[in-house]
């Protein structure tokens, strides 16, 4: 940003702008007459000219500053903001042959696994089984499954020790979210359908969907930046 | 080696019902989809019906809907198929199957059992 | 749902022949078609899944290609135990649908 850009931004008032108080623009006639009044007329004029100029100086330096502050505050921010972008980079788009739903990307296997080598498979993809977060997302999902008899594994199993079914990121499931047909038991996986929800063995081999989450950079809004 | 079993077949008159069962062994029954397919006389092979392992998703042609039932229990390694209002045309020859997912073949076969539905 | 076209319905062939089964889809199913081989009076028995993966303990002779719409199987030396029937099968979208079968006889 260049300092030319900084006193374009500056809207001071017009009596104390830079423009309005300098010295050709004082009135002609008051700097006019017998040579006492003249001398005391010029001696005014100068200190008028002098507490103008010293005014208009400080007026603009003030300023100036308040603006730099501003400018280097925003310059911190945008730093900061580059810093985190830098520390982890976000995804733009969607890798080739991943599917994009609305924050995420999708990848729908076209072979079968049983549901650890799933995980391990979009672990290797730098990616996770789905984690769903409502039934809203859940509908979306299910919209792009194209035949009722294609069952996807998900980033969901039953955890024997807290007797609970478990995302993989650690958290559980809201029962308001899923309704799971099946069995809520020891070595229960969740796949999805084109219509519903299933408990299945997690050794079953079905297809699986991996997740990449889509981090676009936010671009906060600065003057000039 | 997996093995399949099919049973319960014989003659039906028109309108009657039917249960086959097939008896699995040699593998890990609850983690495969099953399926029923079946063949009339000197034809070819129809897909009937196809339950998930669990037993929770079930699909069907749309020859049977409504009349056929597929189900399955899992300690008893045991696939079944309840046939309802029998016709002359599910006559055949009707076979289980391990598989039936898409995108999954049918790897492992019976051999079959014999379904006449005459008066 | 989709229809699948097996051709020829029949053929004579010798032992030690190059025999050609070509199976044709009403719509793109990509590349999930099998192919089994039925003989008489047996159960039908899986060889090439996904169009040309050999299922394990099939003989080498079999080998499947295609995707899309057109998909062949050949048998590159016909042996005595390979006169049979032979259905193509997708796993595309239910109803799962086998072609009407062919029939390799001996000449």
């Known amino acids: 940003m260049d300092q030319q850009a900084i006193y374009a931004e500056l809207n001071l008032p017009t009596d104390s702008g830079p423009e309005s108080s300098s010295p050709s623009s004082l009135p002609r006639d008051v700097c006019q007459g017998s040579p006492w009044h003249q001398f005391a007329l010029k001696l005014s004029c100068a200190g008028i000219i002098l507490l103008v100029l010293v005014v208009t100086g400080l007026s603009v330096s003030v300023t100036s500053l308040i603006q730099k502050s501003s400018i280097e505050k925003c310059s911190v921010d945008i730093q900061q903001s580059r810093n985190k972008t830098t520390e982890r980079p976000g995804l733009l788009n969607c890798p080739i042959y991943w599917q994009q739903l609305r924050e995420k990307c999708l990848l729908f296997s076209h072979t079968v696994n049983p549901w650890n080598n799933s995980l391990a498979d979009c672990s290797t993809k730098e990616s996770s089984l789905l984690l769903i977060r409502d039934k809203d997302e859940l509908i979306h999902t299910q919209n792009l499954i194209r035949d009722k008899a294609i069952l996807f594994w998900i980033g969901l199993n039953f955890s024997l020790s807290e007797k609970n079914w478990k995302w993989i990121n650690g958290s559980f499931l809201n029962s308001n979210d899923l309704e799971i047909r099946g069995d809520a038991k020891e070595n229960s996986c969740i796949s999805i359908s084109q219509t519903s929800v299933y408990s299945e063995y997690c050794s079953t081999e079905i297809r699986w969907i991996c997740q990449k989450e889509l981090t676009p950079v936010r671009n906060k809004v600065y003057p000039d930046s | 080696e997996v093995q399949l079993v099919e049973s319960g077949g014989g003659l039906v008159q028109p309108g009657g019902s039917l249960r086959l069962s097939c008896a699995a062994s040699?593998?890990?029954?609850?983690?495969?989809?099953m399926s029923w397919v079946r063949q009339a006389p000197g034809k070819g092979l129809e897909w009937v019906s196809t339950i998930s392992g669990s037993g929770g998703s079930t699909y069907y042609a749309d020859s049977v809907k409504g009349r056929f039932t597929i189900s399955r229990d899992n300690s008893r390694n045991t696939l079944y198929l309840q046939m309802n209002s029998l016709r002359a045309e599910d006559t055949a020859v009707y076979y289980c199957?391990?598989?039936?997912?898409?995108?999954?073949?049918?790897?492992?076969w019976g051999q079959g059992t014999l379904v006449t539905v005459s008066s | 749902d989709i229809q699948m076209t097996q051709s020829p319905s029949s053929l004579s062939a010798s032992v030690g022949d190059r025999v050609t089964i070509t199976c044709r889809a009403s719509?793109?199913?990509?590349?999930?078609l099998n192919w089994y081989q039925q003989r008489p009076g047996r159960a039908p028995k899986l060889l090439i899944y996904?169009?040309?993966s050999l299922l394990s303990g099939v003989p080498s002779r079999f080998s499947g290609s295609g995707s899309g719409t057109d998909f062949t199987l050949t048998i590159s030396s016909l042996q005595p135990e390979d006169f049979a029937t032979y259905y193509c099968?997708?796993?595309?979208?239910?109803?799962?649908?086998f072609g009407q079968g062919t029939k390799v006889e001996i000449k």
């Open positions: 040699g593998s890990t029954f609850s983690s495969y989809a």
């Open positions: 099968q997708q796993t595309y979208s239910t109803p799962l649908t």
């Open positions: 199957a391990r598989g039936g997912l898409i995108p999954s073949g049918f790897d492992y």
């Open positions: 719509q793109s199913i990509s590349s999930y």
């Open positions: 996904a169009a040309s």
